[in-house]
């Protein structure tokens, strides 16, 4: 056996990540992404 998938980074998902995907689609730039993830970190 290999289990090769565990070494792979996927750009899409087998599950419904609708909420996150819809947020991602509204972020227009790399800077927006950074701000959003900083916000997520701060809210933990």
């Amino acid at each position: 056996g290999g289990g090769g998938s565990k070494h792979k980074c996927f750009r899409n998902s087998l599950e419904n990540n609708e909420t996150l995907e819809s947020i991602m689609n509204t972020l227009e730039s790399e800077e927006d992404f950074r701000k959003y993830f900083y916000y997520l970190e701060g809210s933990k």
Partner: antibody
């Protein structure tokens, strides 16, 4: 030879359960995600479920969510679809399929959902 | 969900004809599109993925093009074994969705 051999279909009454099986050979089964796709009589193709190599990620179509459960046994090179609370609209030919796990050299990421090997199909008829 | 629409739904053609099938996505899917061929009583067969990459073993008379929302499958010279139903499918995002199919029949 890369092959997927299906079993477990049949006639079942509404509300009852059925389990489909898919036996894989000719490739490293636990390297790949797998899928179930169905085709109602005279209709097109509909994705039902997908499961990652280690069952860590499992997705379902809204039409079957909460009723169907996809699982796999990598030691047995087998994929399963447990179908509960069956409805007349679940009547279809069910296919298992292997995911290619396509690598896009431009982005450096893999993508799910390209199905490059298919089983022969098994018929599920839900009727009283 | 992303809706996939194919045109035409039915197509009558003769051996040797050049055949083009179009597929539209309800939103941009980059080049994340696959084409499948299905013959009566048989499982679908992958023909093309990533909009234009020919699957191993598929004859070169098949080709695909397009990106974004509009895609085409072309058969440069239709052969007797090509009479079948063809489906496009987006693999951009969950859930994967198929077009309704295009049945290529003998004229």
């Amino acid at each position: 030879e890369v092959q997927l051999v299906q079993s477990g279909g049949g006639l079942v009454q509404p509300g009852r359960s059925l389990r489909l099986s898919c036996a894989a050979s000719g490739f490293t089964f636990d390297d790949y995600a797998m899928h179930w796709v169905r085709q109602a009589p005279g209709k097109g193709l509909e994705w039902v479920s997908g499961i990652s190599w280690n069952s860590g990620s499992i997705g379902y179509a809204d039409s079957v969510k909460g009723r169907f459960t996809s699982s796999r046994d990598n030691a047995k090179n087998s994929l399963y679809l447990q179908m509960n609370s069956l409805r007349a609209e679940d009547t279809a030919l069910y296919y298992c399929a292997k995911d290619m796990e396509y690598y896009d050299i431009l982005t450096g990421y893999y993508s799910y959902y390209i199905m490059d090997v298919w089983g022969q199909g098994t018929t599920v008829t839900v009727s009283s | 969900d992303i809706q996939m629409t194919q045109s035409p739904s039915f197509l009558s053609a003769s051996v040797g004809d050049r055949v083009t099938i179009t597929c539209w996505a309800s939103q941009g899917i980059s080049s994340y599109l696959a084409w499948y061929q299905q013959k009566p009583g048989k499982a679908p067969k992958l023909l093309i993925y990533a909009a234009s990459t020919l699957q191993s073993g598929v004859p070169s008379r098949f080709s695909g093009s397009g990106s974004g929302t509009e895609f085409t499958l072309t058969i440069s010279s239709l052969q007797p074994e090509d009479f079948a139903t063809y489906y496009c499918q987006q693999f951009n995002s969950y859930p994967p969705t198929f077009g309704q199919g295009t049945k290529v029949e003998i004229k």
